[in-house]
Interface confidence: low
C-alpha cells in the first residue's frame, strides 16, 4: 500500500538459480545410411548452460547438423532459392537467409533441384521445422530453485526469499505454498496461462516476477516476496521477426586433421527473473 | 515531459536479440612449416555466443595459440622479461603479465633471446598485436534484431517495441524508420559518432539505449521507444587498464592421449542494451 | 546527502570486468589404475568463462567425472538408494537426486552394495565432497579490474570510475586507495568479513556494490563511486537448498566413434557487481 509519509527506495537484487531434472529423448538416428530409433538421457549439463544471475535457459528441442566442414556446396533450396543457370547466382553475394557466400555457379542440390553454390560450413543446415512434439517435452517436470537476496542500502536492510524454516522438498503453489521458491516449470506456464508442450517446440521467454513490497518500519514490518508469471515473447509474432526462442551453437572437433563442427540449433525457454519493488520507512 | 501530477513508476524490461550475418575471413595459415592464405566463413555460431538478455557479443578479431600443452617452456620475451642467468628467475614466482609459474631457470627462447622457464600451457601465447584490419571487419554489415518487452506492474500495463504491422525487412534509420528494431551494426556506430573499422581491431563496448517515456492516461496515451547509441568503453584508456574489449577462451581436445587446447583471444564488440524510462498515470 | 530541492534520477550503468591470475593445481590423477600426483596450471581461459557485464565467475574447486558414455549402469549408492531386489526399482522412475532413469533392475554397484540400474551417462557421477582445501585456493591472489561507465540521461551526464590519472598498478584499499578499481579477490572477502579459503571449497556469491551519489550542480559538483562488499549467498543454508555456488558443465568428445563426455562440477565464486545511486541537479 502507498504510504506517502514513507521514504521509499528501489530494491537492489541478486539471483541464483538451480535447475533439476532428467529428460529421456527418443529420436531417429541415421548411421551408415541406416535409420534407427535412438534413446538418450539429458541432464543439466546437457540441456542448460552456465548462465548469469537473472536468466536461465532450458533447452526443450533441437535440430542438429552434424559433420559440417568448410568447403563449397549447394545452398539449401528454400523458397525462392533455386536456380536454373549461373546467371541467377552472384559471386560474392551473401543472402541474409543463406548460410554462405555465393561462388556464382548454379549446381545440383539433389536429383531434381539446383541451387547456387556457396562457400560455407557444408553440408548447409537444412531449414526443417523444429521437431513436434518437442524432444525434451518432459522438461515440463523439471524444477528450478530460485534464491533471491535483496538489499535496501539506504535503509541498511538485507533479506532473502529463502527462510531457515523452509522445506527443501516443497513445490511452489499460489495458494498452498506461495513462499516456496522451488518451481515446477510446467506450473510456471500454467500460472501464466500458457501451454508448455506447445511453447517447447519453438521456444519462448517466460518472466518470473518477484515483487518485494517492504514496509521497514519496526512497528508494522513486513518484507516477503510475491511471485507472478507472464510470457515475455510474442506468440503471435510474424515469421520475419523470428518467433519463439532459439540460438545456434557449435561443437568443434578434428577428424583426419580436418576441422569439423556439429551445429546445434537449440530451441528452449529462457526464464527471466525480474525483481522489483520498494522498501519504505518512516 | 514531466507531469508532476502523475504517479510514475520505472520500467521492468526483458530483451531478446538475434544477430544475422556471415563474414569471410582471409588469414595466413601455417601448416607443416608452409604458410598459405586461408579463407574461412564465420556464421553466428562461430562469432557470437549464447548470451543473456541485455548483452550480446560479436567477435570482430582474434589471435589463436594452437596446440598448447601443459609442460615447461620459456616465457614470451616481452619488454623486461629477458634474462641472462638463473638469478633473474625466481622459482614459484607468478608475474601477473606472464602466463605461467617460473621454475627458476633461464633458458633460450630463440637463437638470440633467453627468458625464464615457466610451467604453463606451452608454447606460451605470443603477445602480438591484434590483426589490422580486423579479420571480421565485414561484421559492420551484420544486423541485429532487438525485441524488447516492457511492463509497468503498478499500472498493469505491458507492451513491446515490435508492432504487428512492422516489416521484417526494415532497417532502423533515425529519420526514415525510427521504430524499426532491426539495426545494422555499422549504422549503430555511425549514429554514435564512432568508426566501426577502427573499433573492430581492439574491440569495444557499445550502448544501445532504449528510452520509454510512457503516458498511460487513456486520454493522451503514448508509449513507444526511442533508440539512441553511445560508446561505453573509454577509447582514450591507458594501456595498463586494458583498452578495448577482449577475452580468452579455450577449445580443449586430446591428441595421442595428451590433453591440448587452442587458446583464442577474441576481440569484439559487446553491445549493452540499456532500457530505461517511466510510465506515468494520473 | 538528500537535497530535497534537487531533481534526482537513477543511474544507468554498464560494467566490464577483467580477471588476472594463474593458479597451480596439485591433485591425484589416476591413469591405467595407477594414482600419482599431477600438477597443472590454470589461467583465465581455464577458470573463468566469457560472461556478461554485471557478473563474473572464478572457479575455485571442481570434481570431474571422466569418460562418461550413454548406457546402463548402477546408480550411485547414496543414502537410501541401495536395493536388495528388483522390487525396490521402478522402471521409468526418475529420482530427482539420481542422474538417470531406472530400468527396474537391481544390480551390483561394487562387491558389497547393490543399487537400481539406470539409463544415464555412465559411470554415474560419484557424490563425493568437494576437495578440501579447494584446488584453486590460490585464486585468493587473483585480481579483477572493474570498469564502470554510468549515465544520467535526464541530466545528459556521463562519467566512469577510471580516471585518466589512475595508475594501472594500483590495488584497491578502503583507506589508502579507495578509488582504485583493481581489486584483489582475497581483499574483497576480507572487507566483507568472509574467509576466502573456506568459501572457495563449496563456492559462493559475493556482491561488489558500487554506489554513485552524484551532485550534478555546477557549484558543488561531485560524482565518484564508493565501493562496498557483502556476501550474497546464505552460508547457513540448509543442505536441501544447495549451499554454496556450483554448476555442472560437460566437455564432449568422440572416442572410437562413441560419444563421450567429461562432466565437471565447478565450484566457485560468482561476483555480482551491483551499481546503484542517483544524480541530482537543482
Amino acid at each position: 500500500s502507498d504510504k506517502l509519509y514513507q521514504r521509499k527506495e528501489p530494491v537492489i537484487s541478486s539471483v541464483h538459480t538451480k535447475v533439476k531434472g532428467i529428460a529421456e529423448v527418443t529420436e531417429n538416428v541415421t548411421e551408415g545410411g541406416v535409420t534407427k530409433l535412438g534413446h538418450s538421457i539429458f541432464d543439466t549439463a546437457d540441456y542448460t548452460f552456465p548462465l548469469q544471475g537473472n536468466s536461465f535457459f532450458v533447452m526443450t528441442n533441437y535440430v542438429k547438423s552434424e559433420g559440417q566442414v568448410q568447403t563449397l556446396c549447394p545452398e539449401y533450396p528454400r523458397r525462392g532459392a533455386q536456380c536454373s543457370s549461373d546467371r541467377r547466382c552472384k559471386k560474392g553475394w551473401m543472402d541474409p537467409q543463406s548460410k554462405g557466400i555465393q561462388t556464382g555457379r548454379c549446381v545440383p542440390y539433389d536429383k531434381t533441384r539446383k541451387t547456387c553454390e556457396v562457400s560455407a560450413w557444408c553440408p548447409t543446415e537444412e531449414e526443417k521445422e523444429a521437431p513436434r512434439p518437442a524432444l525434451l517435452r518432459s522438461a515440463e517436470n523439471f524444477t528450478v530453485l530460485i534464491k533471491n537476496n535483496i538489499h535496501f542500502p539506504g535503509h541498511n536492510y538485507t533479506t532473502r526469499n529463502i527462510l531457515p524454516t523452509m522445506n527443501g522438498s516443497c513445490t511452489f503453489h499460489k495458494t498452498w505454498d506461495p513462499q516456496c521458491s522451488i518451481f515446477r516449470l510446467g506450473d510456471i506456464f500454467q500460472e501464466a496461462g500458457e501451454n508448455f508442450t506447445e511453447v517447447a517446440v519453438q521456444g519462448g521467454i517466460m518472466g518470473i516476477e518477484i515483487y518485494w513490497d517492504c514496509n521497514l518500519d519496526s512497528w508494522s514490518h513486513h518484507c516477503r516476496p510475491r511471485y507472478s508469471f507472464r510470457r515475455l515473447d510474442d506468440k503471435n509474432m510474424d515469421e520475419s521477426f523470428v518467433p519463439g526462442y532459439n540460438f545456434r551453437y557449435a561443437k568443434y572437433y578434428k577428424e583426419n586433421n580436418v576441422e569439423k563442427r556439429t551445429l546445434i540449433k537449440a530451441f528452449g525457454i529462457r526464464f527471466d527473473i525480474l525483481v522489483f519493488g520498494t522498501g519504505g520507512k518512516f | 515531459s514531466d507531469k508532476l501530477y502523475q504517479r510514475k513508476e520505472p520500467v521492468i524490461s526483458s530483451v531478446h536479440t538475434k544477430v544475422k550475418g556471415i563474414a569471410e575471413v582471409t588469414e595466413n595459415v601455417t601448416e607443416g612449416g608452409v604458410t598459405k592464405l586461408g579463407h574461412s566463413i564465420f556464421d553466428t555460431a562461430d562469432y557470437t555466443f549464447p548470451l543473456q538478455g541485455n548483452s550480446f557479443f560479436v567477435m570482430t578479431n582474434y589471435v589463436k595459440s594452437e596446440g598448447q600443452v601443459q609442460t615447461l617452456c620459456p616465457e614470451y620475451p616481452r619488454r623486461g622479461a629477458q634474462c641472462s642467468s638463473d638469478r633473474r628467475c625466481k622459482k614459484g614466482w607468478m608475474d601477473p603479465q606472464s602466463k605461467g609459474i617460473q621454475t627458476g631457470r633461464c633458458v633460450p627462447y630463440d637463437k638470440t633471446r633467453k627468458t625464464c622457464e615457466v610451467s604453463a600451457w606451452c608454447p606460451t601465447e605470443e603477445e602480438k598485436e591484434a590483426p589490422r584490419p580486423a579479420l571480421l571487419r565485414s561484421a559492420e554489415n551484420f544486423t541485429v534484431l532487438i525485441k524488447n518487452n516492457i511492463h509497468f506492474p503498478g499500472h498493469n500495463y505491458t507492451t513491446r517495441n515490435i508492432l504487428p504491422t512492422m516489416n521484417g525487412s526494415c532497417t532502423f534509420h533515425k529519420t526514415w524508420d525510427p521504430q524499426c528494431s532491426i539495426f545494422r551494426l555499422g549504422d549503430i556506430f555511425q549514429e554514435a559518432g564512432e568508426n566501426f573499422t577502427e573499433v573492430a581491431v581492439q574491440g569495444g563496448i557499445m550502448g544501445i539505449e532504449i528510452y520509454w517515456d510512457c503516458n498511460l492516461d487513456s486520454w493522451s496515451h503514448h508509449c513507444r521507444p526511442r533508440y539512441s547509441f553511445r560508446r561505453l568503453d573509454d577509447k582514450n584508456m591507458d594501456e595498463s587498464f586494458v583498452p578495448g574489449y577482449n577475452f580468452r577462451y579455450a577449445k580443449y581436445y586430446k591428441e595421442n592421449n595428451v590433453e591440448k587446447r587452442t587458446l583464442i583471444k577474441a576481440f569484439g564488440i559487446r553491445f549493452d542494451i540499456l532500457v530505461f524510462g517511466t510510465g506515468g498515470k494520473f | 546527502s538528500d537535497k530535497l530541492y534537487q531533481r534526482k534520477e537513477p543511474v544507468i550503468s554498464s560494467v566490464h570486468t577483467k580477471v588476472k591470475g594463474i593458479a597451480e593445481v596439485t591433485e591425484n590423477v589416476t591413469e591405467g589404475g595407477v594414482t600419482k600426483l599431477g600438477h597443472s596450471i590454470f589461467d583465465t581461459a581455464d577458470y573463468t568463462f566469457p560472461l556478461q557485464g554485471n557478473s563474473f565467475f572464478v572457479m575455485t574447486n571442481y570434481v570431474k567425472s571422466e569418460g562418461q558414455v550413454q548406457t546402463l549402469c548402477p546408480e550411485y549408492p547414496r543414502r537410501g538408494a541401495q536395493c536388495s531386489s528388483d522390487r525396490r526399482c521402478k522402471k521409468g522412475w526418475m529420482d530427482p537426486q539420481s542422474k538417470g532413469i531406472q530400468t527396474g533392475r537391481c544390480v551390483p554397484y561394487d562387491k558389497t552394495r547393490k543399487t537400481c540400474e539406470v539409463s544415464a551417462w555412465c559411470p554415474t557421477e560419484e557424490e563425493k565432497e568437494a576437495p578440501r582445501p579447494a584446488l584453486l585456493r590460490s585464486a585468493e591472489n587473483f585480481t579483477v579490474l572493474i570498469k564502470n561507465n554510468i549515465h544520467f540521461p535526464g541530466h545528459n551526464y556521463t562519467t566512469r570510475n577510471i580516471l585518466p590519472t589512475m595508475n594501472g598498478s594500483c590495488t584497491f584499499h578502503k583507506t589508502w586507495d579507495p578509488q582504485c578499481s583493481i581489486f584483489r579477490l582475497g581483499d574483497i572477502f576480507q572487507e566483507a568479513g568472509e574467509n576466502f579459503t573456506e568459501v572457495a571449497v563449496q563456492g559462493g556469491i559475493m556482491g561488489i556494490e558500487i554506489y554513485w551519489d552524484c551532485n550534478l550542480d555546477s557549484w558543488s559538483h561531485h560524482c565518484r563511486p564508493r565501493y562496498s562488499f557483502r556476501r550474497l549467498d546464505d552460508k547457513n543454508m540448509d543442505e536441501s537448498f544447495v549451499p554454496g555456488y556450483n554448476f555442472r558443465y560437460a566437455k564432449y568428445y568422440k572416442e572410437n566413434n562413441v560419444e563421450k563426455r567429461t562432466l565437471i562440477k565447478a565450484f566457485g565464486i560468482r561476483f555480482d557487481i551491483l551499481v546503484f545511486g542517483t544524480g541530482g541537479k537543482f
Epitope: - | 507492451t159 508492432l163 504487428p164 504491422t165 512492422m166 516489416n167 526494415c170 529519420t175 526514415w176 524508420d177 525510427p178 521504430q179 524499426c180 503516458n215 493522451s220 496515451h221 503514448h222 508509449c223 513507444r224 526511442r226 | -
Partner: nanobody, 127 residues
Framework: EVQLVESGGGLVQPGESLRLSCTAS????????IGWFRQAPGKEREGVSC????????AYADSVKGRFTISRDIVKHTVYLQMNSLQPEDTAVYYC????????????????????WGEGTLVTVSS
C-alpha cells in the same frame, strides 16, 4: 484484419458542434499513427488531423486549427474528432485511417499511404 468504424456524422447547422468517433477492433491504438481525412464532393481527399503515437503529438490542417481537436481513449479503443464552429465548407465524408509509425509521412495537408481505412461517415453543415 484491422477494422476502423466511424460514427457520429450527421446534419448540423453552421456554428454547431459534432464529435466523430473511430473505433478500432482487434488492434491496440498505441501501435499506430491515427488520422482523420475528409473528401468533399468533387474534391480531392485531404488530411484534417493526425495523432502520432511516437510522442503523442498532433497535427492539424490550417483550415481547422483552433476548431477541431483530435483525442483518444486507449481503454475504449476509440479516437475522437471534436469539431466546433462547423462551417458549410466542412461538409464532407470523414474517414478515419491508421498506419504504422515506421512510414515517415505528413498527414497534413494529405498523405494517403495509411494502411487501414474506415468506410467513412458523412458530415453535412447546412442551414
Amino acid at each position: 484484419e484491422v477494422q476502423l468504424v466511424e460514427s457520429g456524422g450527421g446534419l448540423v447547422q453552421p456554428g454547431e458542434s459534432l464529435r466523430l468517433s473511430c473505433t478500432a477492433s482487434r488492434f491496440m491504438l498505441d501501435y499506430y499513427d491515427i488520422g482523420w481525412f475528409r473528401q468533399a464532393p468533387g474534391k480531392e481527399r485531404e488530411g484534417v488531423s493526425c495523432r502520432f503515437t511516437n510522442d503523442g503529438s498532433t497535427a492539424y490542417a490550417d483550415s481547422v486549427k483552433g476548431r477541431f481537436t483530435i483525442s483518444r481513449d486507449i481503454v475504449k479503443h476509440t479516437v475522437y474528432l471534436q469539431m466546433n464552429s462547423l462551417q458549410p465548407e466542412d461538409t464532407a465524408v470523414y474517414y478515419c485511417a491508421a498506419g504504422p509509425l515506421t512510414k515517415r509521412r505528413q498527414c497534413v495537408p494529405g498523405d494517403f499511404s495509411m494502411d487501414f481505412w474506415g468506410e467513412g461517415t458523412l458530415v453535412t453543415v447546412s442551414s
